[in-house]
């Protein structure tokens, strides 16, 4: 999906209003310095591409974040404010249902969500020069 035509200000408002709080809740009990940010993004569409990938694609050591509250809200925000996004996700959702696993918070998942927090922060500051 090409995130170029999303309403970035609405997605930012959704993040600041509620998604950010869910990410903090997920990370509660973890020091903010515990993980290094290794994933970056260069502009808002790129940030959303990385956020979608890290939120919804299973990785080694973190099978699925998709059922977490922050993930459900992220998916909803993209569906609302990215035209045509929902339609592109129907097949992906059906595939995900087939391989659904029970929720387990592993250290790898915590690291992944820490990366997500960094991507969202970057998304919210699009004019900032890349380090």
């Amino acid at each position: 999906y090409d995130f170029t035509n999303c309403d970035f200000e609405k997605i930012k408002a959704a993040y600041l209003s509620t998604i950010s709080k869910d990410l903090i809740t997920y990370m509660s009990g973890t020091k903010s310095t515990e993980f290094n940010n290794t994933v970056s993004c260069s502009n808002r569409p790129h940030c959303l591409t990385e956020i979608q990938s890290l939120t919804f694609n299973p990785t080694a050591g973190c099978a699925s974040l998709a059922k977490e509250m922050f993930a459900m809200k992220t998916k909803a925000a993209l569906a609302i404010w990215c035209p045509g996004y929902s339609e592109t996700q129907i097949n992906a959702t059906q595939a995900m249902k087939k391989r659904r696993k029970r929720k387990v918070t592993t250290n790898k998942c915590l690291e992944q969500v820490s990366q997500l927090q960094g991507l969202w922060r970057r998304f919210n500051r699009p004019l900032l020069k890349q380090q």
């Epitope: 609405k10 408002a13 959704a14 209003s17 509620t18 809200k73 909803a76 925000a77 569906a79 609302i80």
Partner: nanobody, 132 residues
Framework: EVQLLESGGGLVQPGGSLRLSCAAS????????ITWFRQAPGKELEGVAY????????YYADSVKGRFTISSDNSKNTVYLQMNSLRAEDTAVYYC?????????????????????????WGQGTLVTVSS
């Protein structure tokens, strides 16, 4: 030019009823979500009730469930808030607000409808006072 015009506020006794109206113009009413917000003196804006003019889906704040009913008349471009069993704590300025994408994505909007930062257009407000 987009306009939202609220009316119907006033003074009512505890236990009484009022019906607020929000008349809209200047945008495609049938695609939009309209939400009633309220602000009591010294308090934050609170989302009260949401309706999608696209599919009629509604959401309510817990504090008004069972007492308030939101409805829409697309032929008149107007949204109503029927408020029954009013309490002193319902005293506030009531605003209606419109958003252009949450109307056609009402199920996904369950997470976001009550957040004022997401709305594009606002009315000027109508004061509701509940007092004996």
């Amino acid at each position: 030019e987009v306009q939202l015009l609220e009316s119907g506020g006033g003074l009512v006794q505890p236990g009484g009823s009022l019906r607020l109206s929000c008349a809209a113009s200047g945008f495609t009413f049938g695609d939009y979500a309209i939400t009633w917000f309220r602000q009591a003196p010294g308090k934050e804006l609170e989302g009260v009730a949401y309706i999608s003019n696209f599919d009629g889906m509604t959401y309510y704040a817990d504090s008004v469930k069972g007492r308030f009913t939101i409805s829409s008349d697309n032929s008149k471009n107007t949204v109503y808030l029927q408020m029954n069993s009013l309490r002193a704590e319902d005293t506030a300025v009531y605003y209606c607000a419109a958003e252009g994408r949450m109307g056609t994505h009402s199920r996904d909007s369950v997470y976001f409808w009550a957040f004022s930062a997401l709305y594009d257009y606002w009315g000027q407000g109508t004061l509701v006072t509940v007092s004996s």
